[in-house]
Every structure is written in C-alpha cells, then in structure tokens.
Interface confidence: low
C-alpha cells in the first residue's frame, strides 16, 4: 500500500549522512517506471534539504543531525509519478518524529531567589517557590523532568537542615522548628535542579530566605526597681525614665513598648508614655502630688509590646518608689473668689468683710495680707486679720471701675516660709444701689421758634437703679413757668418743654427740676435759644445778633 507509518528519528544522530530512513513504494511500479519525490518543510521549503528521497528507489534520506528542541516533528508529502510525469498515487503524508536526547541542562529562572518566612513557624510552612526549566522532553522521557534539591544552607544554625524543597514543584518549606530571627535573620540556600528526575545534569542557584520578626521576645525592664524624688504640686513633671530591652527588631511593633501602671496610683496622679525613639517609658505626674496628704507612692508598671505576643511570655513589671518632696506651698484663699454685697456710699472705715487664706503646709505659718489691685483705691485690708474696710467712696455709678454693679479687687496672702510664697484671692464687691442721683434731662440746649413753636422733647436719665428711677416728676422753678410749660411722658421717660408766651429772639435759662420715684430732686438749667420764626427751627435765621 501507498502508506508510511510515522518514522521516529533520534536527535543529534552521528550519521553517516545521508542516512536511509524508510522506503517509499508504490505497487504501480509493476506497470510502469515510477519516480519518487518529497515536498514540505524540511524538504523543498525551509529548513530545506534536511530530508531527500532517492528518485528511483524511493529511499527517504536524512541529510544532517536533527535538533528536537528546534523542530520536534516534520510533516512531509511523498509523491509518485510515471515516466511521463503523470501522478500515479495521491500525495502521501509522511510524519517524522524527532525523539529526544538529554542534551540540555536545567536552567533556573533566576540566579538568586528571595523569600521570607516568620520566625518560629511550624515545620511544613511554605516559604517560596523556585523554578528551573529544561528544554528537553519531559512528557515522553525523563530528560526534561527536573528534580529540585537543597545542596547547602548558610549559616548552619541551629542546624543544617532547616528547610526542604519539594523535588517536583520547587516549593521551599520549613522542615525544622527553631527559626529565630534574633539568632539568624537570613539564610542562603544553594539549590540544585537535576534533570532525568534527579539522575542527570545539575545546575545551581541561590535562594535567600529572610526570617521575619515575630513578637517572640517580651520587653524586660532593666533595671526593675527605681526610686524617684518629685516636688509636690508639680504637674507634668518627669518622675522617671523606665528602660526595657527587647530582642525583637528595633522600631518594629514587636519591639515598641507599651507601658501600663497596674498598681499604686489610686488617685490617678501619674501617667506613662513611650518615648518614640528610645522606647523608654516616661513616667510623669498627671496631677500635683500632695506631701501633706501622702509623702510616698509605690507604683507598679507593666510593659508589653504594640504587637501581641505570638506565644505565652511572662510580663515584666517594674517597681517605682516615688518620694514626694515638701515645698513651701502658697497660702490659698478660701474661697478663691469671694462675693460680698455692700451698699455704695457707706462711710470710710466701715467693715466690708474678713477674707483669709489657709496655708497647706503642716507648720503653723504666719500669714499677712495686703491689697494687690484696687483700681479706685476704695478699700483697705488689715495685714494680720484679713479684715477689709472702706477707704474711699464706693460709687456704683462710676463706670471706670464698676462693671455690672461689681467692683473687683485682688488681694494677696504671704506666708513666712523660706522662701516666702504668695497666694491671691479675688474679692467681688456687689454694690447695692442707693438713690444718690437725681434725674437729668438731655439735651440741655434747645432752639425754638417764638411763633407757633414746636414742643421740645427731652430724654430723662437717672444713673440709679429701679426703684430709684421712674416715674419722674417735672417742675419749672424760678419763674420759668411764666413762659414755659413742662410735662412728663411716663411711657418713654421724656419731658416735653413748650413755650407758652411770645418771647423775643434771645437766649433764655429755663430752670427745670426733675425728681425720681424716691423723690431725689435734680435742678437742671436748660439753655433755650428763641428765634424769630414759625414752627420748626434748627438754628435762628440770619440776621441774628445774639445777646
């Protein structure tokens, strides 16, 4: 039959060439002379001339060694023609399969592989995968089947078999417990890839395994006991710097310390913070300490890390004995701010109140008093007793010194300690109003026409407080009532001044007496300019020669 089974040819053949492979044979050669030819890649198209055929015998020839890694299979067509060139057979498929020889070594995809794994992980934990390739055939032969192995490990601590590599996949895993970053932070593995599934050619690469830090070391106080001296009353005062050592990676969460006061601070007097660079615990006072109440505090401070421990570790505790140092404390006025009601205008020398201070110190210190700030100079203070008396006229209506009826004075208490200390107190005098001001009209100068005059409306003001104000009463005195009339409008606290009779153009004094609800009377002279005009006027029309 005009058929050829697939032909297998090993690559890298030694020859001699041309080498006979197989004979093409048509059974039509009984009737006529047959000529054979081949076509296809490897014969008459690139790569040309690898194969040929003996024209008359049909022998298929190989002209040169084959390379499977270049071309693994050739597909040719065989042709048979008679002497006159006519086809005697259909083109026949010729498959030439190049069989593999182990002519390539494995190649790692990198010279150096990097991977990382946490310290302390259990055996079996995967670290990384390395890959080697081999151009040889790994499907029909073992020539391209790569087996991985670890050749050596540096350093060899805690022993030389810390890792294993899966012979087929190249996955590197931890095989032994004892990975400790604090002892060995990095391993260099020399890895091998061998073809023939481990029995052939070998190539080498490096795998660097970084051991990542886990929080497997607790911070430890060094030293564990501290003694400190702190002056009483100091807030934000640095009491002590606590030092810890931690074998984990510096500046990592497994190394950074977290401090906690676990005992001895019932009054919440202390606070502790971590210094960002030194990792020390900075113990400071949150509130002032009181020597007189408690002269020694014993604190217990625990230290952990920002990151949780990966295994159960003992917690280190430090003991800090804080000795509170006595300082001469300032006297404290009781209360710090004292409100006293006092009537304005009371006589000089009259007592206002007694305002004293207590000294927190245990010794019975002598306290003397004086006025520190008395804007109007209205008060005096007895240096021994703290009695405050009137030294000037208390005037509720004096807006330079009094705000909202309150006159504010600062007083000083000085002890006889060494050195002396001073405390201040604030005395707030609420001045009770007395009817010491009569009503006053505004404005006190008016201009009015002498014909059909407009009434003049004057506002009434009284510096006193109710009930020493409205309702007001008005009265014209000293014959002013002959020409003028005054009426109080109670609704808006005004007085309406009207011209009753004709007056020639001139300036006149109108004597207006106003009294308040408490009958406090105030006489005011209104200067009235009368003009020759009708109705409303702002200013007398020219010509005008004033008298």
């Amino acid at each position: 039959d005009w058929v050829v089974a697939p032909i297998s040819v090993p690559e890298n053949g030694k020859g001699p060439f041309p080498q006979r492979l197989n004979q093409l044979k048509s059974n039509k050669d009984r009737d006529t002379k047959i000529f054979y030819s081949i076509t296809g890649p490897g014969a008459d198209s690139p790569p040309e001339g690898v194969f040929a055929v003996e024209k008359e015998t049909g022998w298929l020839l190989l002209n040169k060694p084959l390379d499977r890694e270049e071309i693994a299979k050739y597909e040719l067509f065989g042709h048979a023609v008679s002497e006159n060139g006519a086809s005697v057979e259909d083109p026949m498929n010729i498959s030439i399969i190049v069989t593999d020889q182990n002519d390539h070594k494995p190649k790692f995809t990198q010279d150096t592989f990097r991977g990382s794994v946490l310290e302390g992980v259990l055996p079996g934990t995967s670290v990384m995968q390395v890959t080697a390739t081999d151009e040889d055939d790994a499907i029909h032969t073992y020539n391209g089947v790569v087996a991985y192995s670890i050749h050596s490990q540096e350093p060899k601590d805690p022993h030389d078999l810390m890792f294993t590599i899966h012979r087929s996949t190249g996955t590197i895993s931890v095989i032994s417990s004892g990975l400790d970053r604090e002892k060995v932070p990095e391993y260099t593995l020399t890895i091998q890839a061998t073809d023939m599934d481990g029995d052939g050619s070998t190539t080498t690469a490096v795998a660097v395994v970084e051991i990542l830090d886990a929080n497997d070391n607790a911070p430890v106080f060094d030293p564990q006991k501290y003694e400190s001296h702190v002056p009483e009353n100091a807030v934000g005062h640095e009491v002590q710097r606590l030092t810890v050592t931690d074998l984990d990676a510096p500046n990592s969460p497994a190394w950074r310390a977290t401090y906690l006061i676990v005992g001895g601070d019932d009054g919440d007097h202390f606070t502790i913070a971590t210094h960002p660079e030194s990792n020390q615990g900075i113990l400071t006072t949150r509130k002032g300490l009181d020597f007189e109440a408690k002269n020694q505090h014993t604190l217990y401070v625990e230290v952990t890390n920002e990151a949780p421990f990966v295994l159960k570790l003992p917690t280190s505790t430090a003991t800090i004995v804080v000795h509170v140092e006595d300082v001469n404390e300032a006297p404290v006025f009781v209360p710090p701010s004292k409100v006293v009601e006092v009537q304005e205008g009371i006589p000089t020398g009259e007592a206002v109140c007694v305002y004293t201070a207590k000294d927190p110190d245990k010794e019975n210190q002598k306290i003397s008093y004086r006025i520190l700030r008395d804007p109007a100079g209205w008060l005096a203070m007895d240096p021994d007793s703290g009695q405050v008396t009137v030294a000037g006229t208390l005037d509720r209506e004096d807006e330079r010194f009094v705000r909202n009826n309150i006159y504010e004075v600062m007083v000083l208490a000085v002890d006889n300690g060494s050195p002396p200390t001073t405390g201040t107190g604030t005395l707030l005098l609420t001045l009770i109003d007395v009817n010491d001001h009569g009503p006053v009209p505004e404005p006190r100068e008016i201009t009015i026409c002498n014909q059909s005059p407009e009434s003049q409306v004057l506002n009434i003001t009284d510096k006193d407080l109710s009930p020493h104000t409205s309702p007001f009463q008005a009265q014209l005195t000293d014959d002013s009532d002959i020409y003028w009339m005054a009426e109080v409008n109670e609704k808006d606290d005004t007085v309406v001044l009207s011209l009753k009779k004709f007056l020639k153009q001139d300036t006149y004094d109108v004597h207006l007496s106003l009294s308040d609800h408490g009958n406090k009377e105030q006489l005011t002279v209104i200067r009235a300019t009368v003009c020759d005009c009708h109705g409303h006027v702002e200013k007398c029309p020219d010509p005008w020669k004033g008298g």
């Epitope: 010279d111 990382s116 601590d157 002892k183 932070p185 490096v206 990676a249 510096p250 500046n251």
Partner: antibody, heavy 123, light 113 residues
Framework: EVQLLESGGGLVQPGGSLRLSCAVS????????INWVRQAPGKGLEWVSV???????NYASSVKGRFTISRDNSKNTLYLQMNSLRAEDTAVYYC?????????????????WGQGTLVTVSS | DIVMTQSPDSLAVSVGERVTINCKSS????????????LAWYQQKPGQPPKLLIY???TRESGVPDRFSGSGSGTDFTLTISSLQAEDVAVYYC?????????FGQGTKLEIK
C-alpha cells in the same frame, strides 16, 4: 557619636595567621550586623564577612573556611581571625556597621566605617 | 555571584556641571515582595573609608547634600550629581545587597576638568 576603630594589621608570611580587632563606640555592638570589607592596594572594595545580631555569620567564598568573624559584646569589640593567609589577602581591612538590623532599614547598606587596618601577606 | 559593572571607569567634569555614573547588575535587584531595589552608592575620597550616599537605590542617607541623587530599577542604576563641587572628587562605588555575597562595582573615578 558612632565610631569604629580597627587594629591588628601588619606583615605576615603566606600560610600565617592574624587577628584583626574592631572596637566600636556610640552604639551597642550586638544591636547591629557588622561587616568586614577589604580593599587591595589601588583596587576596589570586596565584602568579606558579616556577623548578625544573633551571632549568625556569612562569608565570601574566597575566605570561607579560613576566616572566622566573632565578637565580644562585653568589650564592644568585633574580631576577624584570619588563617592560612595568601598573598591575595593583602588589603586594607575595614569594619563597617550595617544601617539597621532589619530588611526595611536597608541593612545591607553600611553607614559607618572605620579608618581601616593594612594587612600585608608576603614572604 | 551577582556581578556589578560601573561605567565609565573614570571621568573629568567641570565644577557646576551635571555628573552621571551608571551601574549595571547581572541580575535584577528588585525584590517583588517589597518593590525595593537592593542597591547602595558610596563615595571614597583618597586615604579615607567609603561613605554611604544612597540606599534602596534612591534614598539619600541623612547628611548627604541634595545634589546627590540615585535612580533606576531592576538591573540599571544611576548616581547623579546635579552640580559638581570641588569636594566631590572621589571614587564612587555601587553595591548590591540583594544576596550573598554582597558585591561592589569596580568603581568610577571622578576628577575636576
């Protein structure tokens, strides 16, 4: 202030031994990886060895098995024991501190170096 | 071992001019896990030990003037001096710390023209 000071260099015959020292101050020796780097006369730099914070070590293949790196934490001193010395070991030897202990510190970069000590191997 | 190759071996540049020194590694120094390049640059003046200028290929060490900068990734790296000063005359080395053994370039000698 961080300082490293090498000593112990000198003239030695091929096959002989020498111990170099590196006294450090301004930091705790055991807190950082420390390297030895050498420089042959008129030539470039060659890394020799490192000792890790936990005591683990690595060596260049040219010195492996002949040189040993160690340290004495109490004396804050690093050592390089050099045995079976060869002419090609002639160089100025520097000790150099790694930038940090951890990969993210760039620990393979060396931020402080000593002034170096000259080792001459010659017959 | 990873081979580091610097170019040029030497160069002469006028004061105030820009300087670039190249460094090529035989394999990539970029670690995919952290996207960092494990490369440092050093300056060595005559009779002195080397001084660290740059690490992580582009991070300037504290105290190093900002005219020094590093760039590049993978296998190709550059040290640039933006405006050369007289005191910059030295030999410059690149160093990989991707894997052991650490290796240095052969050095580039920089002189004033």
């Amino acid at each position: 202030e961080v300082q490293l000071l090498e000593s112990g260099g000198g003239l030695v015959q091929p096959g002989g031994s020498l111990r170099l020292s590196c006294a450090v101050s301004g930091f705790t020796l055991s807190s950082y990886p420390i390297n030895w780097v050498r420089q042959a006369p008129g030539k470039g730099l060659e890394w020799v060895s490192v000792i890790w914070t936990g005591g683990g070590t690595n060596y260049a293949s040219s010195v492996k098995g002949r040189f040993t790196i160690s340290r004495d934490n109490s004396k804050n001193t690093l050592y390089l024991q050099m045995n079976s010395l060869r002419a090609e070991d002639t160089a100025v030897y520097y000790c150099a501190k790694s930038r940090g202990v951890y990969d993210f510190d760039g620990r393979g970069a060396m931020d402080y170096w000593g002034q170096g000590t000259l080792v001459t191997v010659s017959s | 071992d990873i081979v580091m190759t610097q170019s040029p071996d030497s160069l002469a540049v006028s004061v105030g001019e820009r300087v670039t020194i190249n460094c090529k590694s035989s394999q990539s120094l970029l670690y995919s896990s952290n996207q960092k390049n494990y490369l440092a640059w050093y300056q060595q003046k005559p009779g002195q030990p080397p001084k660290l200028l740059i690490y992580w290929a582009s991070t300037r060490e504290s105290g190093v003037p900002d005219r020094f900068s590093g760039s590049g990734s993978g296998t190709d790296f550059t040290l640039t001096i933006s405006s050369l000063q007289a005191e910059d005359v030295a030999v410059y080395y690149c160093q990989q710390y991707y894997s052991y053994p650490y290796t240095f370039g052969q050095g580039t000698k920089l002189e004033i023209k």
